[in-house]
Every structure is written in structure tokens, then in C-alpha cells.
Interface confidence: medium
């Protein structure tokens, strides 16, 4: 299993969440929210809705080595990964399922997608869950905008992502009580922060690629994904 994602990997996780396309078959999985930030110990709800006609629903945590968190099928005892046993509740039916993950830990930070088992497997658009230490809650915000299609996430690999030494999360935004004159500065800093996040994400990715086989699919795919994500700051996504 991949090692637990760190908050230092936020730029990469954000790129993943933004880069994941929604269901692209006739049957779709509607998934919400797209992104949520919660403190350690809190709970989060992820809802997966389909038009029916499925065998069951998996919730998969994405990353270099995807991991199935739960399997839910009406009338069957749900299967839960050992990491989450005793921390997961379900409500609704497999067609409209709400999965509640409790007592979240920093290591639970990641992108989660619903996988509906149908004639053609379909996938939700992904939920980026950011688990933060309580005192840093103001540092990490995510806008709940729909993800945009991009290059593939990395296929599974045998190695955990190394902890990048140079990456950092988005900078602390200015206080809400700042003077209106500071709005321009805020906008500038926000743009700068996003740009820095992209640069840092690429730095992390290059580290990962130099650390692993440079010819591997995972390496090139992470590069592609990061690049297209950064480009979306100023131009339409090339894969939409």
C-alpha cells in the first residue's frame, strides 16, 4: 500500500482531484463534495449517487497505488479496509449512498472516488479530503468546483510517494478583516500562491521521477498531470 499522503503533498493531491474526469459512460456516478477540509478527529460525508442498475459501490482512495476503502451492496454486510474499521458509517442505498468517515487522521488525506459496478464500471469525479491539524485549519482551503478532465492519474506502483523536502502547503491567506485596499494584494498573493503550488508540485513530481524508473508510466503520467493542471490556471485544459 502506498504510504499515507502528507499535507506536504497538497499540490499533488489538488492536481489529482482537479485532474480526474467524471463518469464517462451512459450511466454516471454523481459524487459530492468535490473537496472538503476538516480538522483531525472530525468526520466527512461522501455521497455517491447513480441511476440504478448496479451490483454495488466501492470507495477507492487514489494515488500511486489505489486502495479500496469500502464495498457496499444492498442486503450484504459491507466490507471495510482495516484502516477504516470502526470509523465508517453508511446511510441510504447503493443507488444513493452516503459514506461517513469518522475520526479522520492526517494520513487519511487523499482523493477518494466512488466506483459503481455496472456493465461498464463507472467512476465518480473524486472527493479531495484534506485533513489538517486544528491550529492550521485556516491554511488549507479548497473551492468546491467540479473537477476538470485531465491526463491520467498514475497507475498503481509498488512504492509510496517519498516525502518531498522542499514542498509546502498553500500560504496562510491574509485575515478576513484586512482593509479593502488590500484586496489587490490578496488577489496577487493568491495567484502567486497557486503558481508556487504548481511549481512545487512539479518539483515533487520531478523528485519522484528521479527517485523511480524514469521510463515508468507513473513517472510520465504524473508529469503530464501536473503540467496540464498548472496550465489550467491560465488556459483551458488540453484534455477537456
Amino acid at each position: 500500500m502506498a504510504g499515507p499522503p502528507r499535507l506536504l503533498l497538497l499540490p499533488l493531491l489538488l492536481a489529482l482531484a482537479r485532474g480526474l474526469p467524471g463518469a464517462l459512460a451512459a450511466q454516471e456516478v454523481q459524487q459530492s463534495p468535490h473537496c472538503t477540509t476538516v480538522p483531525v478527529g472530525a468526520s466527512v460525508n461522501i455521497t455517491c449517487s447513480t441511476s440504478g442498475g448496479l451490483r454495488g459501490i466501492y470507495l477507492r482512495q487514489l494515488g500511486p497505488q489505489p486502495q479500496d476503502i469500502i464495498y457496499y451492496e444492498d442486503g450484504v454486510v459491507p466490507t471495510t479496509d482495516r484502516r477504516f474499521r470502526g470509523r465508517i458509517d453508511f446511510s441510504g442505498s447503493q443507488d444513493n449512498l452516503t459514506i461517513t468517515m469518522h475520526r479522520l487522521q492526517l494520513s487519511d488525506t487523499g482523493t477518494y472516488t466512488c466506483q459503481a459496478i455496472t456493465e461498464v464500471n463507472v467512476y465518480g469525479s473524486g472527493t479531495l479530503v484534506l485533513v489538517t491539524e486544528e491550529q492550521s485549519q485556516g491554511w488549507h482551503r479548497c473551492s468546491d468546483a467540479p473537477p476538470r478532465a485531465s491526463a491520467l492519474p498514475a497507475p498503481p506502483t509498488g512504492s509510496a510517494l517519498p516525502d518531498p523536502q522542499t514542498a509546502s502547503a498553500l500560504p496562510d491567506p491574509p485575515a478576513a478583516s484586512a482593509l479593502p485596499a488590500a484586496l489587490a494584494v490578496i488577489s496577487f498573493l493568491l495567484g502567486l500562491g497557486l503558481g508556487v503550488a504548481c511549481v512545487l508540485a512539479r518539483t515533487q513530481i520531478k523528485k519522484l521521477c528521479s527517485w523511480r524508473d524514469k521510463n515508468s508510466a507513473a513517472c510520465v503520467v504524473y508529469e503530464d498531470m501536473s503540467h496540464s493542471r498548472c496550465n489550467t490556471l491560465s488556459s483551458p485544459n488540453q484534455y477537456q
Epitope: 500511486p64 498514475a154 497507475p155 523511480r212 515508468s216 484534455y239
Partner: antibody
């Protein structure tokens, strides 16, 4: 659906391009792989092309095959066929999040037969 | 490169019996394995993916298990229609390991 075409009898060394035509889904959303099967033998994975157009090959296939795509087709070019390349060639769609094939490959085309003989 | 070793090469069992096919990877592929069924003159059909997930519409008589380097496909209550060749495939991520097939197992139903 998925369907291969372009298979025929060729002489050794004559380049050949096979085409996989897809319908009902978009190649910008799914990866596609090529697999071959020599008469009476097992399946042999050749390579895959992802949604962004990057191709990855089995080590034995690197340099011998080239995978490329358009909006509705995926091509497999055999640069210099030998008699050992005589086989039925299949293309298949990758399943998995964003269409990558870590959930296997399905559907498959019926295959197209390539015969390399002098 | 990864090597997928499938055993046995051939097996014969009566209707109603059980067949077990094993697939061994030369390195850990952490459950990223698919099983296919192929009948003469037809393309392969995906049965199981991620080692144990049954493809929609496939009978629950087919069961996949295993992790790491050792995987098993079990077919119970054999039917005549199960006569086919079965292949395992690595779906593990790096380009050197990705996609490799086992050599196949021919299942004969008596």
C-alpha cells in the same frame, strides 16, 4: 465497441499499420492496449496508449512497435515484421479510474490476423 | 521484467467439479491482477480484476483471490460452457511490469 482492421499477408521487413476503431466512448477518456496471439499460443501484451497520447510498451516490444492515436482510432505500426510477428492482433479498452487499465481490459475487438511470410 | 507463471497448463474436470488455477508473479503486484476467459476464435473476456472483483454479469462461480505474488482463480460447479483457456494478467503500474500475461490454462470439462 472496438474493432481492429489492417491485418493482411506481408513479406518480412514490410512495415504494416493496424487500426483499432472505437465507438461509444472517447479515446480522451480511456486508455487502449494492444495484445497479440500467435496461432495456437497464448496472449502477449504489446503496449498501451493513455488518454494524453503517451504510449508505453512491453520491453520486448520497444522499438519494434509504435502506438499512436487520433480522436477515434488507435494505430499499431509494426516497423519491420518478421515471421515471428504472425499473429492475431487485438486492441482493448482500459478500465479503471480515468480509463487506465489497472482494472483490466474490456471490451476487446474480435482481432485482425497478420501473416508474415516470404 | 515481471514474469507471470500460470499452473497447470491444462486441467480436466467433470461437470459439477471445481478447478483451481494458480498464477505466480515474479515480484509483488499488490493485487493488481486480472483473469480472462478465452474460447477458440473469440477475443478474451474479462472475468475478474483487482485480484478478486467480479466483472458485472460474470457468474459468482468464478472466484479470484490472492495478493502479493500468489493468485488463484477458482471455478466451482463446472459447466460445459466453462471449457476455455484462462489467462492471468498483471495490471501493476510501472511500464516494465505492466500488462504481462500468464501462459494460460486450458480447462476441459468432461
Amino acid at each position: 465497441s472496438v474493432e481492429e482492421s489492417g491485418g493482411r499477408l506481408v513479406t518480412p521487413g514490410t512495415p504494416l499499420t493496424l487500426t483499432c476503431t472505437v465507438s461509444g466512448f472517447s479515446l480522451s477518456s480511456f486508455a487502449m492496449c494492444w495484445v497479440r496471439q500467435a496461432p495456437g499460443k497464448g496472449l502477449e501484451y504489446i503496449g498501451i496508449i493513455n488518454t494524453g497520447g503517451s504510449a508505453y510498451y512491453a520491453s520486448w516490444a520497444t522499438g519494434r512497435f509504435t502506438i499512436s492515436k487520433t480522436s477515434t482510432t488507435v494505430d499499431l505500426k509494426i516497423s519491420s515484421p518478421t515471421t515471428e510477428d504472425t499473429a492475431t492482433y487485438f486492441c482493448a479498452r482500459g478500465n479503471g479510474y480515468a480509463g487506465y487499465g489497472y482494472d483490466g481490459f474490456d471490451p476487446w475487438g474480435p482481432g485482425t490476423l497478420v501473416t508474415v511470410s516470404s | 521484467d515481471i514474469v507471470m507463471t500460470q499452473t497447470p497448463a491444462s486441467v480436466s474436470e467433470p461437470v459439477g467439479g471445481t478447478v483451481t488455477i494458480k498464477c505466480q508473479a515474479s515480484q509483488s503486484i499488490t493485487s493488481w491482477l486480472s483473469w480472462y476467459q478465452q474460447k477458440p476464435g473469440q477475443p478474451p473476456k474479462l472475468l475478474i480484476y483487482a485480484a478478486s472483483k467480479l466483472t458485472f454479469g460474470v457468474s459468482s462461480r468464478f472466484r479470484g483471490s490472492g495478493s502479493g505474488t500468489e493468485y488463484t482463480l477458482t471455478i466451482s460447479d463446472l459447466e460445459c460452457a466453462d471449457a476455455a483457456t484462462y489467462y492471468c494478467q498483471s495490471n501493476y503500474g510501472s511500464s516494465s511490469a505492466y500488462g504481462a500475461f500468464g501462459g494460460g490454462t486450458e480447462v476441459v470439462v468432461k
